[in-house]
C-alpha cells in the first residue's frame, strides 16, 4: 500500500518522494532496505536524503533497489517504500515500455502534454521537447511552463514525447529526461447540453442495510471528443472528497463510452456497508460541460426482505 515504483536513467538526476505522508511530519529518515543502512543527508553525497525526497545526483544502475522512508513525529512513525530501478541509456532511439510514463490523449482543442515528475525538481524554463527522438521545431509547438502545447493537432502528432530539463542542485546541473506517449482523439463531432441517462430524476434506489451498493451516474455530451465534460456525485450538495465519509467513494477516473456515436461518461459511487444514516442523504448525479450543468437526485430506501412462498 505504501510502496511506489520509480525509475530513471544512469547519469541523470532522479528524485523520489516518500510514498508515505505523515500528519504532522517532523523528519523523514531514509534507509537502503537490503542493508538497513541509513542514507546520508549531506549534499556532498551522490545519493542523499532531503526530507520527503531521496535524491540520486546522478543515478547509477547499482542504485537500483528498495528504499525505506520513515516519517517521524513525536507521536507516530510511518513507513513507506520506494522501489527504484535505474536503467542503462539506450544507444538507439527507441524508448522501452518500462521507461514510459502514463499515456495522455489530446485533441484539436486540448493538446497539453505535461512533463512527468518535473514538480520534484529544481528546474528553470524552457523545457526541451522531442518526438521520437527528434527535437520539436516549428511554430505549432510551444513549451509553456511544465507542458508542451501543440497547435492544430493532427493524427500524425501521435507518438512518444520526451521532455528534457536541467535540475540544479547547489550550482551543479544534472540532466533529466522523461517520456510518455501521446494519442490523438478524433475531433469530428459536436457538443450539447448534458443528457443524464442514469439515474432517472428523483429515482428511489433500494438498498440493503449492511450490504454494499453502487450508484452509476451516466451522461452523454455530444458526438466525438468532448472538451471539458465531467460527471460526478455529490452528497447533500457536498463533493464526495469533502464529505469525509470513507465508506462512500467515487470510482477513480471516469469511464468513457460511445453510445450510438455519442460521447458519454459514467462515474460509479460505491457505498460500503450501507448504514441507516445513508438513507437520509441526498445523492446528486451531476453532469457538466461548457453548455451547463444538469443534476439528477437519487435517494436510497431500505429494501424489504423478499417474501418466500412455497
Amino acid at each position: 500500500k505504501f510502496s511506489k515504483q520509480s525509475w530513471g536513467l544512469e547519469n541523470e538526476a532522479l528524485i523520489v518522494r516518500c510514498p508515505r505522508q505523515g500528519k504532522p511530519s517532523y523528519t523523514v529518515d531514509w534507509y537502503y532496505s537490503q542493508t538497513n543502512k541509513s542514507i546520508p543527508t549531506q549534499e556532498r553525497n551522490r545519493v542523499f536524503a532531503s526530507g520527503q525526497l531521496l535524491k540520486f545526483l546522478p543515478a547509477a544502475v547499482a542504485d537500483s533497489g528498495i528504499y525505506t522512508c520513515i516519517v517521524r513525529s513525536p507521536t507516530f512513525n510511518r513507513t513507506g517504500y520506494a522501489n527504484v530501478t535505474i536503467y542503462k541509456k539506450q544507444s538507439d532511439c527507441n524508448v522501452p515500455d518500462y521507461l514510459m510514463y502514463s499515456t495522455v490523449s489530446g485533441s484539436e482543442k486540448n493538446s497539453k502534454i505535461y512533463c512527468p515528475t518535473i514538480d520534484l525538481y529544481n528546474w528553470t524554463a524552457p523545457l526541451e521537447w522531442f518526438k521520437n527522438c527528434q527535437a520539436l521545431q516549428g511554430s505549432r509547438y510551444r513549451a509553456h511552463k511544465s507542458f508542451l502545447v501543440i497547435d492544430n493537432v493532427m493524427t500524425e502528432d501521435a507518438g512518444d514525447y520526451t521532455c528534457k530539463f536541467i535540475h540544479n542542485e547547489n550550482g551543479a546541473n544534472y540532466s533529466v529526461t522523461a517520456t510518455r506517449s501521446f494519442t490523438v482523439k478524433d475531433e469530428q463531432g459536436f457538443s450539447l447540453f448534458p443528457v443524464i441517462g442514469a439515474p432517472a430524476q428523483n429515482e428511489i434506489k433500494e438498498v440493503e442495510i449492511g450490504k454494499n451498493a453502487n450508484l452509476t451516474c451516466s451522461a452523454c455530451f455530444g458526438k466525438g471528443t468532448q472538451f471539458l465534460a465531467a460527471v460526478l456525485w455529490q452528497l447533500n450538495g457536498t463533493k464526495i472528497t469533502d464529505f469525509g465519509e470513507p465508506r462512500i467513494q467515487q470510482e477513480e477516473g471516469q469511464n468513457q463510452s460511445f453510445s450510438n456515436g455519442l460521447a458519454c461518461l459514467d462515474m460509479v459511487l460505491r457505498i460500503a456497508d450501507v448504514k441507516e444514516e445513508d438513507l437520509l442523504l441526498q445523492y446528486d448525479c451531476l453532469a457538466l460541460n461548457l453548455h451547463g450543468l444538469r443534476r439528477h437526485t437519487v435517494r436510497l430506501s431500505r429494501k424489504n426482505p423478499i417474501d418466500h412462498h412455497s
Partner: antibody, heavy 118, light 112 residues
C-alpha cells in the same frame, strides 16, 4: 469545512467508566491523527493521548496510562476516548482535536463535559 | 516532561493597547530540523481553544496580523499590537516538540 462533533455531557459516579465520541467530517479521517485534551474547571489544558486512525496505533500521557483507551472506527470516521475508574478530579471538559500536515491541534471539537459525582 | 511557564497569569488592558504575554519552556523547543515547536492558542469562555500561531511565528489561517510571536529556543513572546474587543480571552502557549505535549497555565486578558 472540517468539523469535529462530540457526544453530549455525561454525569458519572466515582469508579464508573465514560466513553466519549468524536465524529469527523470534511477531511479524510485516516489521514490525520486524533488527540484528546482534558480541561478541568477553571484550569488549563492537559494532553491525554492520541490515535493514528489508519493503523489504530495509540500513545498516552503517563498520567492517564492504564485508565484511558482511545479507539477509532474508520467506517464512521469517529474517534472514541474511554476513561475508567473515574474520580472527582476527572470532572472536566474533554476535547478531541485533529492534526494537519504541519501541526497538531489544528481542529477542535466543541468539548464534552464529564461530571463525576456521588 | 517539558514545563511551560506563562506570565503574567492575568492582565488588564484597554482596546487599542499593545499587549505582550511571555512563555518560557524548561527545555529548548528547537528541533534538529530547524523548526521551533512552540504554539499559541486563544480560548474564550465555554468555547474550544483556537490555534493562533504555530511553529513559533506562523499565523494560522484566518488569524489577524495584529497577532505576532517571536522568541529563541526557550523564551517566547506573544504580542497583540492593538487589542480589539474580540481579543479578550485566555491565551495558552504549548510545546509539540516531544511527548507528553504540554501547555502553559494560561494568561487571561481582561478589560481594564
Amino acid at each position: 469545512e472540517v468539523q469535529l462533533v462530540q457526544s453530549g455531557a455525561e454525569v458519572k459516579k466515582p469508579g464508573a467508566t465514560v466513553k466519549i465520541s468524536c465524529k469527523a467530517s470534511g477531511y479524510i479521517f485516516i489521514d490525520s491523527e486524533m488527540h484528546w485534551v482534558q480541561q478541568a474547571p477553571g484550569k488549563g489544558l492537559e494532553w491525554m493521548g492520541a490515535i493514528d486512525p489508519e493503523t489504530g496505533d495509540t500513545v498516552y500521557a503517563e498520567k492517564f496510562q492504564g485508565r484511558v483507551t482511545i479507539t477509532a472506527d474508520k467506517s464512521s470516521s469517529t474517534a472514541y476516548m474511554e476513561l475508567s475508574s473515574l474520580r472527582s478530579e476527572d470532572t472536566a471538559v474533554y476535547y478531541c482535536t485533529g492534526s494537519t500536515t504541519d501541526y497538531y491541534f489544528a481542529y477542535w471539537g466543541q468539548g464534552t463535559l464529564v461530571t463525576v459525582s456521588s | 516532561d517539558i514545563q511551560m511557564t506563562q506570565s503574567p497569569s492575568s492582565l488588564s488592558a484597554s482596546v487599542g493597547d499593545r499587549v505582550t504575554i511571555t512563555c518560557r519552556s524548561s527545555k529548548s523547543l528547537l528541533h534538529s530540523n530547524g523548526i521551533i515547536y512552540l504554539y499559541w492558542y486563544q480560548q474564550k469562555p465555554g468555547k474550544a481553544p483556537k490555534l493562533l500561531i504555530y511553529q513559533l511565528s506562523n499565523l494560522a489561517s484566518g488569524v489577524p496580523s495584529r497577532f505576532s510571536s517571536s522568541g529563541s529556543g526557550t523564551d517566547f513572546t506573544l504580542t497583540i499590537s492593538s487589542l480589539q474587543p474580540e481579543d479578550f480571552a485566555t491565551y495558552y502557549c504549548a510545546q509539540n516538540l516531544e511527548l507528553p505535549f504540554t501547555f502553559g497555565q494560561g494568561t487571561k486578558v481582561e478589560i481594564k
